[in-house]
Amino acid sequence: DYKDDDDKFRDCAEVFKSGHTTNGIYTLTFPNSTEEIKAYCDMEAGGGGWTIIQRREDGSVDFQRTWKEYKVGFGNPSGEYWLGNEFVSQLTNQQRYVLKIHLKDWEGNEAYSLYEHFYLSSEELNYRIHLKGLTGTAGKISSIAQPGNDFSTKDGDNDKCICKCSQMLTGGWWFDACGPSNLNGMYYPQRQNTNKFNGIKWYYWKGSGYSLKATTMMIRPADF
């Protein structure tokens, strides 16, 4: 943990601009609050300053969690984790953020989707996701349905399906009915990762049944 006692950083961009340019776990402070949260900062990719809000890489963490767990975050920032919807909501309502989603398949290929505008609504509005300005190599159609849906978990069903997408597909996500993505689905190892309806899905890159090897969701202020 690279945090100095006197430092107060809202995001990894502020950490970077303060002179900390090494990848690692830093302590961030909620906007307009003294509450703190630990996050992994990517200080190398694409100019650095990225706050990692989600990472999947080895299946070591269970992502079939409750609403409260997705709200406050879970996992290990140095490995698989979810930063927390409340922090991300508060942060992205302070200023304009971009969202970059980096994906890896099991054949050694990588792709990304970059949204030039990103924010999460408040908990009262079920942390609805808002995305605009899609570019990147992981599909010209957004695999997160637009306009965004409310967040759903196994104990908080806010999707547009008479089924319960979070229970059926596992993991908390901005399910539609149920929609073309779920980066918080079940982790399947190599050679068991095809024809999996409840895996880690990004439809407009790999299709419906392909479960990805690794994913990272990261945010950064648009004016970085």
Epitope: R96, H117, Y119, L125, H130, K132, L134, T135, S142, P147
Partner: antibody
Framework: DVQLQESGPGLVKPSQSLSLTCTVT?????????WNWIRQFPGNKLEWMGY???????SYNPSLKSRISITRDTSKNQFFLQLNSVTPEDTATYYC??????????????WGQGTSVTVSS | SIVMTQTPKLLLVSAGDRVTITCKAS??????VAWYQQKPGQSPKLLIY???NRYTGVPDRFTGSGYGTDFTFAISTVQAEDLAIYFC?????????FGGGTKLEIK
């Protein structure tokens, strides 16, 4: 259901200020989304004028920036357009509308029925 | 500002025809393009958003496609109630801008 209703004078004299009100029912303007003013000139050309977001931040069309102000009254769930120093070229039908994104311009899913404004002496 | 050039300006069609309207953006608009229908005496109504997503309650005869600078709107089987002006709009960059409109008239 979300409904928007424009109101204001139908006739404004040149060099004066145009003031319009949009009253929103069925959704709180402080909850989410951006709340826009758009106008349609005779001949059907549409022009986005600006918005006030749910958080209270504003964004204006640069072509109008020196003349336009959008404000709100959250207790009445209303937002307002003021356009200063009007000329006959500001004659149009004025619409208020809700856009699907709260912090930036976006497509607009709910529109008022429009109010016609003529600028003439 | 991004200029949206919409063609044609007028479409004269018969009920049952398929019609296509195009919008060309002066620079990339990603997939941030919407299509509206405005019937006589009414306000515009959102039909398509994010280039290809049909808005709630919009009949599936209305479709949109495109990415970047070239966008297409189609009505697969025109009906008499489709008499209207159709507008494209980009909202990729501010200020959002509209096409000049296509007036659809039924023979």
């Amino acid at each position: 259901d979300v409904q928007l209703q424009e109101s204001g004078p139908g006739l404004v004299k040149p060099s004066q200020s145009l003031s319009l009100t949009c009253t929103v029912t069925g959704y709180s303007i402080t909850s989410d989304y951006a709340w826009n003013w758009i106008r349609q000139f005779p001949g059907n050309k549409l022009e986005w004028m600006g918005y006030i977001s749910y958080s209270g931040s504003t964004s204006y069309n640069p072509s109008l920036k020196s003349r336009i102000s959008i404000t709100r009254d959250t207790s009445k769930n209303q937002f307002f357009l003021q356009l200063n120093s009007v000329t006959p070229e500001d004659t149009a039908t004025y619409y208020c509308a809700r856009s699907t994104f709260g912090h930036y311009v976006s497509s607009m899913d709910y529109w008022g029925q429009g109010t016609s404004v003529t600028v003439s002496s | 500002s991004i200029v949206m050039t919409q063609t044609p300006k007028l479409l004269l069609v018969s009920a049952g025809d398929r019609v296509t309207i195009t919008c060309k953006a002066s620079q990339s608009a990603s997939n941030d393009v919407a299509w509206y229908q405005q019937k006589p005496g009414q306000s515009p109504k959102l039909l398509i958003y994010y280039a290809s997503n049909r808005y709630t309650g919009v009949p599936d005869r209305f479709t949109g496609s495109g990415y970047g600078t070239d966008f297409t709107f189609a009505i697969s089987t025109v009906q008499a109630e489709d008499l209207a002006i159709y507008f494209c709009q980009q909202d990729y960059s501010s200020p959002p801008t509209f096409g000049g409109g296509t007036k659809l008239e039924i023979k």
